[in-house]
């Protein structure tokens, strides 16, 4: 897998071109993830049926994962900078501890996944520099995180498949949010 | 090749203050968490303290026994953590390991990738 943009401090710019700006970065590590994911859900279509399965079918899971909502502020109806960013870090930060469980899911593209979740953790280090209301944002509590990495780590395969295609499909939207929110900003 | 090198150890006397220091080579340090732990002879390694990759609240934790006398930081531009041990008891003489995860459950020692070879720390009563 190719290093994820702005892991490396020294990126090496093109001669005479403009260095990106903080909003071009966030823009294209959103992006380079997103291509991420859509590897990760490739494999993981190929493997399982679980693509097929409608989306109230799927709906039926006890997972809490980050979603976004019209009181975030970061729909066009309501938007509001601040409480949208705010909304952004913390729940890269929630999916922080799903990327991890995936990083176990994949065989042949356990780089990719890996790419993922490192990417993730530089875009939230770039939108930390950019938020001004960082009392705002808890880090996730390490002994919760421990014990539902356990707990998804039990279930049984075809819960496995399932939780990993929620997971990857959330994500994904969560993203593409954030990505029409950022460009507002 | 990723190194962890751990400094600052010796013996000191109940009471007294330490500062250990890690520096880290090979490693995406600012996106790594980082821990420290400790093993008494005959003791099973115990967390002791970490410090979250983020700057957000709640980004250190420690083992209640150390709370309030141990202080965790880190500094991004050195690649290097530290842990300030203060008003040291002698259940606190052991050998302290510092230690990189990229986990989100950054307190558990067997979610921790890189570890440095040890520094000991010796309280004499």
């Known amino acids: 897998a190719p290093v994820p943009p702005g892991e490396d401090s020294k990126d090496v710019a093109a001669p005479h071109r403009q260095p990106l700006t903080s909003s071009e970065r966030i823009d294209k590590q959103i992006r380079y993830i997103l291509d991420g994911i859509s590897a990760l859900r490739k494999e993981t279509c190929n493997k399982s049926n679980m693509c097929e399965s409608s989306k109230e079918a799927l709906a039926e899971n006890n997972l809490n994962l980050p979603k976004m909502a019209e009181k975030d502020g970061c729909f066009q109806s309501g938007f509001n900078e601040e409480t949208c960013l705010v909304k952004i870090i913390t729940g890269l930060l929630e999916f922080e501890v799903y990327l991890e469980y995936l990083q176990n899911r994949f065989e042949s593209s356990e780089e990719q996944a890996r790419a993922v979740q490192m990417s993730t953790k530089v875009l939230i280090q770039f939108l930390q520099k950019k938020a001004k209301n960082l009392d705002a944002i808890t880090t996730p509590d390490p002994t919760t995180n421990a014990s539902l990495l356990t707990k998804l780590q039990a279930q049984n395969q075809w819960l496995q498949d399932m939780t990993t295609h929620l997971i990857l499909r959330s994500f994904k939207e969560f993203l593409q949010s954030s990505l029409r929110a950022l460009r507002q900003m | 090749e990723v190194q962890l090198v751990e400094s600052g150890g010796g013996l000191v006397q109940t009471g007294g203050s330490l500062r250990l220091s890690c520096a880290t080579s090979?490693?995406?340090?600012?996106?790594?968490?980082m821990g420290w732990f400790r093993q008494a002879p005959g003791k099973e390694r115990e967390f002791v303290a970490a410090?979250?990759?983020?700057?957000?609240?709640?980004?250190?934790y420690y083992v209640d026994s150390v709370k309030g006398r141990f202080t965790i930081s880190r500094d991004n531009a050195k690649n290097t953590v530290y842990l300030q041990m203060n008003s040291l008891k002698p259940e606190d003489s052991a050998v302290y390991y510092c230690?990189?995860?990229?986990?989100?459950?950054?307190?558990?020692?067997?979610?921790?990738?890189?570890w440095g070879q040890g520094t000991q720390v010796t309280v004499s009563s």
């Open positions: 230690a990189a995860t990229r986990s989100t459950a950054w307190n558990s020692p067997q979610r921790y990738d890189y």
């Open positions: 090979g490693l995406a340090f600012s996106i790594y968490t």
């Open positions: 410090a979250h990759w983020t700057v957000f609240r709640g980004n250190t």
